[in-house]
């Protein structure tokens, strides 16, 4: 499988909720010995590799913001911890997973990375990355909804 980002750029007015999304495309290994681990973090546009550096999102590290599932086990996430920081993690059965930042401020602006790790017993882990930019516009009068687009596109789509 691979990880894609439906949108590479989110522009949000201050005070709105921003939902950033990644999508797993292609078949995911099934079985009791397979675990899929998903997480989020802030990064910087590194010279060598995008998403290499891992910085916290609202003081929560990528370790705090994980969800994982595999075998016959349900998703596991530090839900309460995330909510206390105005964050929400979500995942569906179609490969989509997202992080929502509530009441965004300009300090939330940056390069967000999703990381998916496929773990199989006795196999080295496989890593898959996705990245997207969040730009938060200061001031309450800068629009009412977040706009999501691909940077190369001129059209933009209103995101939830």
């Amino acid at each position: 499988f691979k990880v894609t980002t439906p949108y590479s750029l989110y522009v949000c007015p201050e005070g709105q909720n921003a939902t950033l999304t990644c999508r797993i495309l292609g078949p995911v290994s099934k079985g009791h010995d397979v675990t899929i681990y998903k997480t989020w973090y802030l990064s910087s546009r590194g010279e060598v590799q995008m998403c290499s550096e891992r910085r916290p999102i609202r003081n929560l590290t990528f370790q705090d913001l994980h969800l994982h599932h595999g075998g016959h086990q349900a998703a596991n996430t530090s839900h309460d911890l995330a909510q206390r920081h105005g964050l929400e993690l979500a995942s569906d059965h179609h490969g989509n997973f997202s992080i929502t930042l509530r009441n965004v401020t300009p300090r939330d602006s940056g390069l967000y990375c999703c990381l998916v790790i496929e773990l199989k017993n006795h196999h080295p882990e496989q890593r898959f990355y996705g990245s997207m930019e969040l730009q938060v516009q200061a001031g309450k009068g800068s629009g009412s909804t977040c706009m999501a687009s691909n940077e190369q596109d001129s059209d933009s789509i209103t995101a939830a």
Epitope: T35, T39, Q63, L119, E125
Partner: antibody, heavy 118, light 106 residues
Framework: EVQLQQSGPELVKPGASMKISCKAS????????MNWVKQSHVKNLEWIGL????????SYNQKFKGKATLTVDKSSSTAYMELLSLTSEDSAVYYC???????????WGQGTSVTVSS | QIVLTQSPAIMSASPGEKVTMTCSAS?????MYWYQQKPGSSPRLLIY???NLASGVPLRFSGSGSGTSYSLTISRMEAEDAATYYC?????????FGSGTKLEIK
């Protein structure tokens, strides 16, 4: 505050078995793998194996299969390593360390010194 | 298994001096990790994913490399940097450590 508290030093006789504990606190135990590392007197570090508290899955260094058995007790957030049929070559300091998936061992226990001697 | 060879085995540096140590892998690895260990203490994570500083690590430390050749650099040696440094790989089972570089202060 993240802490990994290991059990105390052990002096054991050759042929005996023993179990080292590693109590985790200050983080979500099931979000990490617990790794065990041996450091012998020549100071080399050797990875023994790991266990995932999330699903109980284990992976071992082939060298330590049959020598070490890894288990966890999720209810007490404690990882265990049992060392079997000890010989003088097993005398070493043993560390537990947590590792987030796709990362490194960022917190280590203080180490448990094991001396095998008659 | 992947063998990690560190060189030099022992080195010494004066305060303020630039220090570089290397880690050579017998097969290509995706990322390298570096740990610092002082006598009587547990190892401490310094560098993750080849070049990123772990939390709380001073900016004078840096890592670089790819494939089979990696290095750890201290831009200006300080007395507290005297320790043994280990490289480590997670790319292939069994996960392995280098034999260490012992760094002493002159």
């Amino acid at each position: 505050e993240v802490q990994l508290q290991q059990s105390g030093p052990e002096l054991v006789k050759p042929g005996a078995s023993m179990k080292i504990s590693c109590k985790a606190s200050g983080f979500s135990f099931t979000g990490y793998t617990m790794n065990w590392v041996k450091q012998s007197h020549v100071k080399n570090l050797e990875w023994i194996g790991l266990i995932s508290p999330y699903n109980g899955g284990t992976s071992y260094n082939q060298k330590f299969k049959g020598k070490a058995t890894l288990t966890v007790d999720k209810s007490s957030s404690t990882a265990y390593m049992e060392l079997l049929s000890l010989t003088s070559e097993d005398s070493a300091v043993y560390y537990c360390a947590r590792r987030a998936y796709g990362y490194a061992m960022d917190y280590w226990g203080q180490g448990t010194s094991v001396t095998v001697s008659s | 298994q992947i063998v990690l060879t560190q060189s030099p085995a022992i080195m010494s540096a004066s305060p303020g001096e630039k220090v570089t140590m290397t880690c050579s892998a017998s097969s290509s690895v995706s990322y390298m990790y570096w740990y610092q260990q002082k006598p009587g203490s547990s190892p401490r994570l310094l560098i993750y994913d080849t070049s990123n500083l772990a939390s709380g690590v001073p900016l004078r430390f840096s890592g670089s490399g790819s494939g089979t050749s990696y290095s750890l650099t201290i831009s200006r040696m300080e007395a507290e940097d005297a320790a043994t440094y280990y490289c480590q790989q997670w790319s292939s089972y069994p996960f392995t450590f280098g034999s260490g570089t012992k760094l002493e202060i002159k």
